[in-house]
Interface confidence: low
């Protein structure tokens, strides 16, 4: 499904939107993208606050989540290949709109590493607990869905669209109703502030048709960083209500005629702007004119002011604006440089990490080393990479490449291997014979044995005792391994082609066969056997367990 | 209107249990929180927990946790509050509230309350 | 546990005059812009009544000759014009986190 259900939640520079639907995080990030913005950034406390107000909105018009968990994606995710990276705050995650590593966290759990594959962030609300202001929602890391699963407990998203500014919201003098449409498609009545680009219309009256009046306006740039609708007076008067209605619209003081008419005006230290309804301190620079970080330094007699920047930054030709140094111009480091607000730092490709001789040097990342490796059995380091390999019997397998899994030969593409019974077991596999029939020197096929119908000869065993129950094997069958006594995996084998009549049953004792000549004498159980319906992973088999294995000594029919 | 109607009062021993009835009607009863407040004689209000009616979910002053179980009957719009091991100090008028779903969890409707004596 | 407390306990004002009550909180209840800070009434046999939410939003039908402000940890209750059906247990209520912590109440009386 799409998004739904949204809510906004303008501050600053920057509108929060917060949508439930079930969407994959790539789905929800071009959902904002269409509208201009991106997944939300939580790059502080007081971002967080807003994020989870947006939210709050968003819950009261949903009115009750069934889910005890909510989950709502943010703009945090580590691409496939890059590693988990604990000392950092955002551990190795960044933020989808681009930006520093930010010094604000609030992860849920520690996070597992893992390299593999791409992950996403989102925002966790606890919806069994009440939801709090002093409570922000964690962090949640995790897979980033796909079109057909979105994620399991995803609920929605949160988008941030940022503006060049934002317009006070209007004040009605009188009654009516205003309709504010932003440059992302939102409409609301009620904003705390109105980003730039926004239409604005007023609809005058108590809802009586013949005295209704519109209005419409539009947020505009009025000079640098003064951004207001262009309007002149309160909206939607009326002498009926004079001063009394929403203080007439005034943002301070409200002065009534004697004819019903009024006029706002400004407490001392403040001045009256042009919209006529808006007060501003005298003092030019209680109206922040400087921007980015630059402080405001008044002049002499407290006429005019300049604009200063911090380290790391200098003035714009708007002489207002503090525009960051790019640092990475005179390439500083080995690798990768990243222009940061104020500075730069030092960052290495993929496979590598900081280290080496000099400032900013990279070094390779050993991915094979002790306790680090993310391969199920061979592990090769490369310069930057890694890959990973298999031991002879097994071959590379999950969605990854870093896992093994075990060749079953007792099925593979030639057909049987063994003429009559054939064993797959962990990396390997063996031949076994019917009763009545040994396994010839070369370990695959059978040769007519003595005429007792008894296993074969060989040493005497424990497991002989009392076991004369015989199974019933039929031509060609296959079965799901049994549990012995002990738990230890019983093997009821393949049978490919036997040398007896098809059409008589044939009665086994507990097999056991006789190594083939690589490893003479050596007595085992079958552990596991090739089963068309194989229940779970295959389990190695134990030191102690009795299976006739082959040696991967080229030998036909081995491995 | 929006209308919370509690049950009657109760007289009961120590160390027994009381469960109060709220029942709501005029509103989504999913769609707003439940709280139970208390009020001894001659005290202020404390606030004893919320249910959420629509997943039955429960948040419990840790004072009261263990001895109380808020929940509640959808079918029938009601909550009930039971309170265990009752002692002389639990002698109190219990009021039920409801809050919005989040944010301010101001409470702007509670019901008449209910007078518990536990007496021996 | 965020402490609530009430000043004055008892208040006595003469009918039409101007009442104040005083809430503080042992910690800020503001969050992100907003007070949560609530008022109640109580008269004698009755549940208390929502008069004023997030520190200054009057409810709906509530006279507006009560009014609130504040913000922090300071926060102030007025009866511009006190009238004999005000006459009443007030009590402040913070909601920003738990438990849920109401002020000890002050009762306001006619002189």
């Known amino acids: 499904t799409g998004a739904d259900t949204e809510a906004v939640v303008c501050v600053g520079t920057a509108c929060y939107t917060a949508h439930s639907g079930k969407l994959s995080a790539a789905e929800a990030q071009n959902h904002c993208n269409q509208n201009g913005g991106n997944l939300a950034t939580v790059k502080s406390k007081e971002e967080a606050q807003h994020v989870q107000r947006v939210l709050a909105q968003l819950l009261r018009r949903e009115a009750a989540l069934t889910a005890r968990m909510s989950k709502f994606w943010i703009g945090l995710q580590r691409e496939k290949g890059k590693c988990l990276d604990p000392s950092l705050p955002l551990k190795g995650f960044s933020w989808v709109g681009g930006g520093e590593d930010t010094p604000y966290s609030n992860w849920h759990k520690e996070l597992r590493n893992s390299c593999i594959s791409k992950r996403c962030v989102s925002l966790l609300l606890d919806l069994s607990q009440p939801l709090l202001p002093s409570r922000l929602p964690k962090w949640s890391e995790g897979p980033c869905g796909s079109p057909g699963s979105p994620g399991s407990n995803i609920e929605g998203f949160v988008c941030k669209f940022s503006f060049k500014g934002m317009c006070r919201p209007l004040a009605l003098g009188g009654p009516g109703q205003v309709t504010y449409t932003t440059p992302f498609q939102t409409t609301s009545s009620s904003l705390e502030a109105v980003p730039f680009a926004s239409a604005a219309n007023v609809a005058c009256g108590e809802g009586d048709k013949d005295e209704t009046q519109s209005h419409y306006f539009l947020c505009k740039e009025k000079a640098p960083d003064v951004f207001d609708w262009g309007s002149s007076g309160p909206l939607c008067v009326s002498p009926k209500y004079g001063c009394n209605f929403n203080n007439g619209g005034c943002h301070q003081d409200c002065f009534e005629g004697g004819d019903g008419s009024f006029l706002c005006g400004c407490r001392p230290g403040f001045r009256l702007l042009d919209d006529l309804v808006t007060c501003a301190s005298r003092n030019p620079c209680s109206s922040s004119p400087c921007r980015g970080g630059a402080t405001c330094v008044l002049g002499p007699h407290g006429k005019n002011y300049t604009c200063r920047c911090p380290q790391g930054y200098q003035l714009d030709s708007s002489q207002l604006d503090c525009v960051d140094v790019d640092e990475c111009q005179d390439s500083p480091c080995a690798q990768e440089c990243v222009n940061t607000p104020g500075g730069f730092r030092c960052e290495c490709w993929v496979g590598y990490e900081p280290g080496g001789p000099g400032e900013g040097a990279c070094q390779d990342v050993d991915e094979c080393a002790l306790g680090r490796s993310p391969c199920a059995q061979g592990c090769t380091n490369t310069d930057g990479s890694f890959h990973c390999s298999c031991e002879e019997g097994y071959v590379l397998a999950g969605e990854d490449g870093t896992q093994c899994q075990d060749v079953d030969e007792c099925v593979g593409p030639g057909g049987p291997l063994c003429d009559s019974l054939c064993f797959n077991t962990q990396g390997s596999f063996h031949c076994g014979c019917l009763p009545g029939w040994v396994l010839a020197p070369n370990g695959v096929s059978c040769t007519m044995g003595p005429v007792s119908l008894g296993p074969p000869s060989g040493p005497p065993d424990e497991e002989d005792k009392g076991e004369k129950e015989g199974s019933t094997v039929p031509r060609a069958a296959t079965a799901s391994p049994t549990r012995g006594p002990e738990g230890t995996p019983k093997a009821t084998p393949t049978t490919s082609r036997p040398s007896l009549s098809s059409d008589a049953p044939i009665t086994s004792a507990p097999l056991k066969m006789l190594a083939p000549s690589g490893s003479p004498g050596v007595w085992r159980e079958p552990s596991i056997h090739h089963a068309t319906a194989a229940s779970g992973p295959q389990e190695p088999a134990g030191g102690d367990s009795s299976v006739a294995t082959q040696n991967n000594d080229g030998t036909d029919g081995q491995k | 209107q929006v209308q919370l109607v509690q049950s009657g009062a109760e007289v009961k021993k120590p160390g027994a249990s009381v469960k109060v009835s709220c029942k709501a009607s005029g509103y989504t009863f999913t769609s707003y929180w439940m709280h139970w407040v208390r009020q001894a004689p001659g005290q202020g209000l404390e606030w004893m927990g919320e249910i959420d009616p629509s997943a039955s979910y429960t948040y419990y002053n840790q004072k009261f946790k263990g001895r109380v179980t808020m929940t509640r009957d959808k079918s029938s719009s009601t909550v009930y509050m039971e309170l265990s091991s009752l002692t002389s100090e639990d002698s109190a008028v219990y009021y039920c509230?409801?809050?919005?779903?989040?944010?301010?969890?101001?409470?702007?409707?509670w019901g008449a309350g209910t007078t518990v004596t536990v007496s021996s | 546990d965020i402490v609530m407390t009430q000043s004055p306990d008892s208040l006595a004002v003469s009918l039409g005059e101007r009442a104040t009550i005083n809430c503080k909180a042992s910690?800020?209840?503001?969050?992100?812009?907003?007070?949560?800070l609530n008022w109640y009434q109580q008269k004698p046999g009755q549940p208390p009544k929502l008069l004023i939410y997030?520190?200054?939003n009057l409810e709906s039908g509530v006279p507006d000759r009560f009014s609130g402000s504040g913000s922090g940890t300071d926060f102030t209750l007025t009866i511009s014009s006190l009238q004999a059906e005000d006459v009443a247990v007030y009590y402040c209520q913070q909601t920003n986190e738990d438990p849920r912590t109401f002020g000890g109440g002050t009762k306001v009386e006619i002189k």
């Open positions: 910690q800020s209840v503001d969050y992100a812009g907003d007070s949560y």
């Open positions: 509230a409801r809050s919005v779903y989040y944010g301010n969890k101001y409470f702007d409707v």
């Open positions: 997030a520190a200054s």
